[in-house]
Every structure is written in C-alpha cells, then in structure tokens.
C-alpha cells in the first residue's frame, strides 16, 4: 500500500521536510503533489512525468520544494503556514489512480526565556514572590528548576497560568536559591538565566561569644556579636544601660572589677525595621596574672635539638609547676627542670614530644593554668612506605601506588620509573598497565625544612602469569613449645589464590595452624618437634598455577631427660664401666657427667677402665642446648662390688 | 576424580549461533578459572578466553571480542561459550580448560572436545 | 600479541634418539609451557613453567630457557613420544600457542 512517512514529523520553522514515499508501485505514468488532504487542482504543489523526466509546478508551488525520481517530496525552508497534510496522486501506466495522504506540524524554535519577578526582596514569613516565565509562547510547555534540581513539593509552591508563573507563599530564608524556567515545544528546549531569590530576614535573637563570663583583673575583654540577619545586621553595645558603641566587636583592654556588669548586644535589620538584643552578665576576680609559657625554639629538629621552655612572669617567692599531656612531668633523663622550676628543658627531642606542655602558678587558693603549649618537632622524613604491598599485577588493571613517609612538615614526594622522574605527587596512577610498565618504581620523600631526603624502591612486574613461589619465613629457628612461626607465601599479588601443603598433604585441622592474609600467610603457634615437616604453598590466578620450593621448618627442641646405658647399676671390680648418655636434642645437646658432684669430663661416653669399690657413687649426666637455652640431667647409682662376692654381676664392657 | 565433558557441537548454518556447554564434576567451577580453546582441523591450538564463574569476570582474545561469550551457571557446576556469527573458518573443535593447584602440583584439566562445523 | 615461532615445525626420529624442539617469542615471557597432543585427543600439560615436568611425564623430557628462548628436549626417543609439541604462553593477554612440532617416526 502506498504510504506517506513525514521526516521529520514535527519541524522547526526554517528547517526542511522530507515527505518520504514507500512502496511505490512499478510501471508509473507520473505522480503529482497537494496541498490538503485531497487531490485539487488549485493547491496542486508540483507534477512529474516520468516518461520526459519533467517536473511543473502547479499553483500551491512555492519555489521551495523539491521532487525526487522516487516521488518523495522535499520542502525546504519551512514556514509556519506549511503545517498540515499533503496528498499524492500517482498516474499508473495503466492510468489507474493511487493517492496518498501524510502530514507534518511546525513549530517556532523558542527564544532563551527569562524570569520576571514582582518582589526582589521579599521578607521571611510575610511576603510571597511570583516568579513568570517570559515571553508567553502558544504550544510550549513550561518547566522550573531550584538550584538545577525539579520542583520540590510544598505547600507553599504554587504553579498557574499553565505553569508559566511560579508563586512561593510565605517566603523563608531556605527559599534563597537558584530558580531557572524552562520553555519547551516538540522542536526545541531553552532555559533561562538563574534568578537568585534575594530574601530578607532576621535579625535572629543574637549571640555572644565567647560564652565565658569570669574574667581575671588585667585581662583583655573581648565580646563578638552575631545574629543571622540579610541584609546583615547593624550592632550596637551597651554596658549596665548605657550606649557604648556601634560594632559587631566590643574590646576593653586590661578590665578591672569595675568592668563587671550586663553588656547588652543589640542587632538591627534596617530593611526589615527589626530589633533584637541578648543580655550577658561579665564577672571580673582580683587575681595573679595567667602564666604563659615562652620556647627557646619554635621548631626543634629531632635528635638534634634541645628546647628550653620558661613559665612566665617570674615573680618572686612563686611555686612553678609544669604538666605535659595533662599529666605531671615523668620521670626522665631527657627531661630537666631549672633550680626554680621556672624553665623546663628538653634534651635530644623527638616526635614524641610535642606535648601540650602546661605550666602553672600556685597561690594561695588555687594554681593559675597557662595556656597550652605545642612543640613543632621537626623529623623524618622516615623510610617511605609504598602501598599496596602488591608486586605482581595482571595486565589490563589500573595501577594505583600510595607513598608515605612520616615527616613533619609533611614530606613533598616524588616518583621515579627505572630512575626516571615521572611525577611530584603522592599517589602515581597508570591506567590499563601492559607488561612495558613492569620496573623499579622509587618514590622519594623530601622534608623541605631539614633538607633531608629518603627512598624506597619497589619492582613491579606485570604480567598474566604469576612468578614460581617462594615461601619467607619469620622465624628460620623456632624453639618448641615456646615461639611462633608465620610463614609467608610470596609474591603479594592481586586476584591470587594461595594454598598450603605440609609434607604433600592438604594442612590438617588444628588450633595451633591459622591461615590469614587472604592465606597468603601460614602460622604456627607453639611449634611443636613434630611440625619440622616440608611446607609447601601454591599459588593460582586466571592463567598459571606455580608451587614453592619446599621449606623444612627447623624446630629447635630440647634436651629431654636423658637416659644413661647400659642400664645396669650393679658392677664386679676389674670390670670396665662404659655408660654412654643420649638426650633427644635439636641441636644435638652438650654432654658432660659428674661422679659424686665431681665434674668430670664433657663427652657422651663416660669411660673408666678396671672398676674398683672405690669407684662407687652417684654418676650424673648433665645436657645442655645452647640453641634453646635449655638444661636437663640424670642421676644413676653404680654399686661396685669385690670380685666374686655377688652372683649376677656384670662382667662390664 | 576431576572430568570436564563439552556438548553442543555439531553442524552450524554460516551466520548462526552456536552455545557450547562443559559440565565439570569431581570439583566445584566456583574455585577455577574456565578457559576456553579451539582448535581448527590440521592446526595449532587458539585461546578464546577465560571466565571466572564465581563473579564473571572475563578475559577474552580481542580477535573473539563482540563474538564470543562465555557465561557460567554455578548451581549447574557448567560454563558455556556462545559464539555468534559464525563463518566457516571457526570450524574446530572446542575444548574447555582449567589450570589448577588442587594438588601440591600443578594440572591442567582438558574436556574431551567438541567438534564444531560450519558449512551451508 | 605475543608471537610463539617452534622449531621445527616437524621432525622424523628414531627410537633412542636425542630430540630438541625449540620455542622462541617475539617479547620476553616470564615462563614457556608445553602441551603434548596426539591425534584425536585433548593436549595434556606436559612441561610447566619452562622446566617442571607435570604429574606422570617421564624423566626423559626437560625444559629449559628464559626470556625469548626456550627449549623441549627428549634424551631418548621412545614410541609413546610421537605426537604433536605446543608451547604457549601465559605472561600476556592474549595467551598464545607455537604453530606445533610434530615428532614422526623415521
């Protein structure tokens, strides 16, 4: 069937439209076009004979259209008056008759709005503001913003006049904000500028501060006002009654008791014709001077400097007292205090000792405070730390690398890659790594006021696979029943699966192994001799699986009681004694023996040729492991009798 | 006993799809990476991708980018490969792969392969 | 992508005889890897990370190499080793396979 497709359907005035024509038949005469969703001779548009390829304008012809072969029809520069149907008549070869109708609308593209506002000043709680978007404009849609964001719901907006006028009743100051309007039609979409709703307020009831009302003879007076107020408030003082002056600020240097009294705040709205005031009552003691604290050195370098901190004033026949962090001075020999407890000095400080330092004045009722006093040591900077631990990443990923070192002033950083500098940054970022990014990544940390520099070097490899593991250990010679070992599977890599073997089985179950780290570390507490095995780990990700090396654990054990043979305690005389001594020991024990409490050799074999009775007595074998710190010993008694006398005896070795 | 068995080969209209599955038993897909490879009749091997079928993640050879992909459904212990567009030049046979350390030594699980052929 | 040449791409042996097939790569690669695959079935991990022999290869086989070039090597041929010889990499997306060796009887 013959159809009409309106490219587009709704056009801006200006623009151009093509009426498309589809499924136009074969063997065709010619084709005309209307105006008007019949065929007239009088809104004929244009003709085309195919036959002699000749096109005639026909009187609706308007010198912008165009006729394609295809028969669409192009209708450039469009007017407001194009709006409506246009109809196509097509002449077959047979001379039958097809017709076809399409439409088209047209739209103005809208000019930028703008808002017009019967209030530029409204007060809070009083007025309200209708906000109108200009111009008035037939076929558009009209849409508000408040600080870019559509309308809240409230009670208090209020949208007429078919959304062109937005009223906000009973304005608040909350309702100061960024209102835009939007026109739209199918062709177009313009916003207004912003318009800052300007709203009066205030003054609220003010405040006073600082809110302390006991003040010291000789002390400073110095109240500030403040009410929240638009336009901002004027501010006047009064002290018990009487004008004082007219400032947000009231300062009376070195008051005495006679400035105790009410000082009254007054704010002032001169747009909104409102008053409010605040009454706060001002106490002035007779009293010593608040101590103060004076420093040798305001910015001491650690390890190197020393600081000497004096309580101030001196006055004669004063008790001084001194207190860092809130508590009383420890004891120390980096810390000393002058004869008169006035001066405080710190030898060799360190970053440990900024404080707050404290001193104080005692008199008879009560100990003055002075302020507090905060060392700015200077130190590092500290080997950097560069984080995450990783060294292995997979290409593709984004690689993000963190340096810190502690310093203060805090340290400037700079990156290298295979000794070029990349950045002076404190994070180095490289998005989609690829294996060319694998090298030795410096960062440099630089404290610019003790001039000192620090590196740390970190390589790091990108690649799919991931390298054979390896396994590092805390501890290469654990003592039984006393350390803990972690062993650490390495590379830290990202995405990585770590497993653990123990003499090529899967870990047993039991409370003394504990797997942390992503598994990536295997512990060991109180190692047992049992546990000198062959650790393995294993490493997986996406494309390779790799093993470790097996590490044997080297359980340092021992000695255990010792046992002493032969076994035999009865001897004949002549015989040889020959005891030979054995302690289960890792590393294998230092032996040595006693006869009677009578230190005799440091062997393991205890030798003594042709026995005699003399040679009866309590023979003590004595083990020690220098590794484990450990002793042990055993006492066994040997009879010797004269020959002959007693049947079963041995005959000895 | 670790055994991966791929299905859904066979013949293939030139421009059709294919979705090839591989059943895993004797292991959960959830802890391995599945990866998939072919293999064109009197060639070399070619490495598709993997995918992760825990999360589903995926890495994929930029030549079979847009054509193929690979899915998991881990209450089924399978993985799949979806390949669209087919030319005939992507007959092969299809192999589903992992790379495991289930054991202290590294192995390497291959399906039995399934044979793929695109022909009108 | 990583570009994996092996050398040769075929060879004829006899049983006994010393085999080398080499793998070179047109970028560094951390490890090589190789599959054996004979006719009609599914390749098996043969060598892994360049010289570790996977689980039931016979001690005959060994691997060796680092960077660009690496090395299968069979000490003594035996009837069970005919078959086809890949190497593939891993360091580098996408993974990548060599053309293949195939070992035939002389």
């Known amino acids: 069937k013959l159809t009409i497709e309106s490219t587009p359907f709704n056009v801006a005035e200006g623009k151009e439209v093509l009426l498309l024509v589809h499924n136009l038949p074969q063997h065709l005469f010619g084709y005309s076009w209307y105006k008007g969703e019949r065929v007239d001779g009088n809104r004929q548009i244009i003709g085309y004979v195919i036959g002699t390829q000749q096109a005639t304008p026909g009187p609706a012809y308007s010198g912008r259209e165009i006729i394609y072969p295809n028969a669409s029809l192009l209708i450039q520069n469009i007017i407001q008056n194009d709006t409506g149907f246009y109809t196509l008549h097509v002449i077959k070869s047979d001379l039958v008759n097809e017709e076809a109708t399409g439409q088209f609308r047209v739209y103005p593209e809208l000019p930028k709005p703008s808002i017009s506002s019967n209030n530029s000043k409204p007060v809070e709680d009083k007025d309200a503001v209708a906000f109108t978007c200009e111009p008035e404009t037939q076929d558009a849609t009209y849409l508000w913003w408040v600080n870019n964001q559509s309308l809240p719901v409230s009670p208090r907006l209020q949208l007429s006049n078919g959304n062109r006028t937005l009223t906000l009743f009973n304005v608040t100051r909350n309702d100061t904000a960024s209102y835009k309007c939007e026109t739209q039609n199918p062709v177009s979409a313009r916003r207004s500028d912003s318009v800052i709703l300007n709203v009066l307020y205030g003054p609220d009831a003010p405040t006073i501060s600082p809110l302390n009302t006991s003040y010291r003879s000789g002390e400073n007076l110095n109240l500030s006002c403040h009410a929240a107020s638009n336009p901002p408030a004027q501010y006047s003082w009064f002290v018990n009654g009487t004008f004082q002056q007219s400032t947000q600020e009231l300062f009376i240097p070195n008051i005495t008791v006679n400035n105790s009294g009410s000082y009254t705040c007054q704010a002032h709205n001169s747009d909104t014709g409102l008053n409010r005031t605040t009454v706060t009552t001002i106490t002035v003691y007779a009293e010593p001077p608040k101590p103060f604290i004076t420093s040798n050195n305001s910015n001491p370098v650690e390890d190197e400097d020393a600081v000497a901190l004096t309580c101030e004033p001196e006055i004669q026949n004063t008790t001084y007292l001194w207190w860092v962090n809130n508590q009383s001075l420890p004891v120390s020999p980096r810390l000393q205090l002058s004869n008169d407890n006035r001066t405080l000095t710190l030898l060799s400080v360190t970053r440990n000792d900024v404080g707050p330092y404290e001193c104080g004045i005692q008199n008879e009722l009560s100990v003055d405070h002075s302020d507090p006093v905060i060392l700015n040591v200077l130190y590092g900077p500290d080997d950097p730390t560069i984080s995450p631990s990783y060294t292995y990443y997979r290409p593709g990923v984004n690689l993000s690398l963190s340096c810190h070192a502690a310093s203060n002033p805090p340290a400037q950083y700079s990156w290298l890659i295979d000794g070029n500098i990349q950045q002076h940054t404190q994070e180095l970022f490289i998005s989609n790594i690829t294996e060319k990014n694998s090298g030795l990544y410096t960062c440099q940390a630089n404290n610019s006021a003790s001039g000192h520099s620090r590196t740390t070097v970190k390589t790091i490899t990108v690649s799919a696979e991931l390298p054979k593991p390896s396994i590092s250990s805390n501890n290469s010679k654990p003592v039984e029943d006393k350390d803990a070992v972690a062993f650490t599977c390495e590379p830290e890599a990202q995405n990585t699966t770590y497993l653990w073997w123990v003499n090529g089985q899967s870990l047993p179950v039991s409370p003394r192994l504990q797997l942390s780290n992503g598994n990536r570390t295997l512990t060991l507490f109180n190692v047992t001799r049992n546990d000198a095995r062959a650790y393995v780990c294993g490493i997986q990700n996406s494309v390779s699986a790799n093993r470790s090396d097996p590490v044997t654990l080297d359980v340092l054990y021992g000695p255990d009681t010792p046992i002493i043979s032969p076994p035999d305690s009865s001897y004949l005389s002549g015989a040889n004694l020959n005891l030979s001594c054995h302690s289960a020991s890792n590393p294998s024990p230092q032996y040595s023996w006693r006869i009677n409490g009578i230190p005799q050799q440091h062997t393991q074999v205890l030798f003594i040729a042709k026995i005699t009775p003399n040679n009866n007595g309590t023979y003590a074998c004595f083990v020690s492991n220098l590794a484990t710190g450990r002793n042990n010993s055993i006492v066994k008694s040997i009879t010797v009798s004269a020959s002959g006398t007693s049947p079963g005896l041995s005959a000895g070795a | 006993e670790v055994q991966l068995v791929e299905s859904g080969g066979g013949l293939v209209q030139p421009g059709g799809s294919l979705r090839l599955s591989c059943a895993a038993s004797g292991f959960n897909i959830k802890d391995n990476y599945m990866h998939w490879v072919r293999q064109a009749p009197g060639k070399g091997l070619e490495w598709i991708g993997w995918i992760d079928p825990e999360n589903g993640d995926t890495e994929y050879d930029p030549k079979f980018q847009g054509r193929a992909t690979m899915s998991a459904d881990t209450s089924k212990n399978t993985a799949y490969l979806q390949m669209n567009s087919l030319r005939a030049e992507d007959t092969a046979v299809y192999y589903c792969?992992?790379?495991?350390?289930?054991?202290?030594?590294?192995?390497?699980?291959w399906g039995q392969g399934t044979l793929v052929t695109v022909s009108s | 992508d990583i570009q994996l040449t092996q050398s040769p791409s075929s060879l004829s042996a006899s049983v006994g005889d010393r085999v080398t097939i080499t793998c070179s790569a047109s970028?560094?690669?951390?490890?090589m890897h190789w599959f054996q695959q004979k006719p009609g079935k599914a390749p098996k991990l043969w060598i892994y990370?360049?010289?570790n022999l996977a689980s039931g290869v016979p001690s005959r086989f060994s691997g060796s190499g680092s960077g660009t070039d690496y090395t299968l090597t069979i000490s003594s041929l035996q009837p069970e080793d005919f078959a086809t010889y890949y190497c593939q990499q891993r360091s580098s997306y996408p993974l990548t396979f060599g053309q293949g060796t195939k070992v035939e009887i002389k």
């Open positions: 792969n992992i790379i495991t350390m289930a054991t202290p030594y590294p192995m390497d699980y």
């Open positions: 970028t560094s690669v951390i490890y």
């Open positions: 990370s360049t010289s």
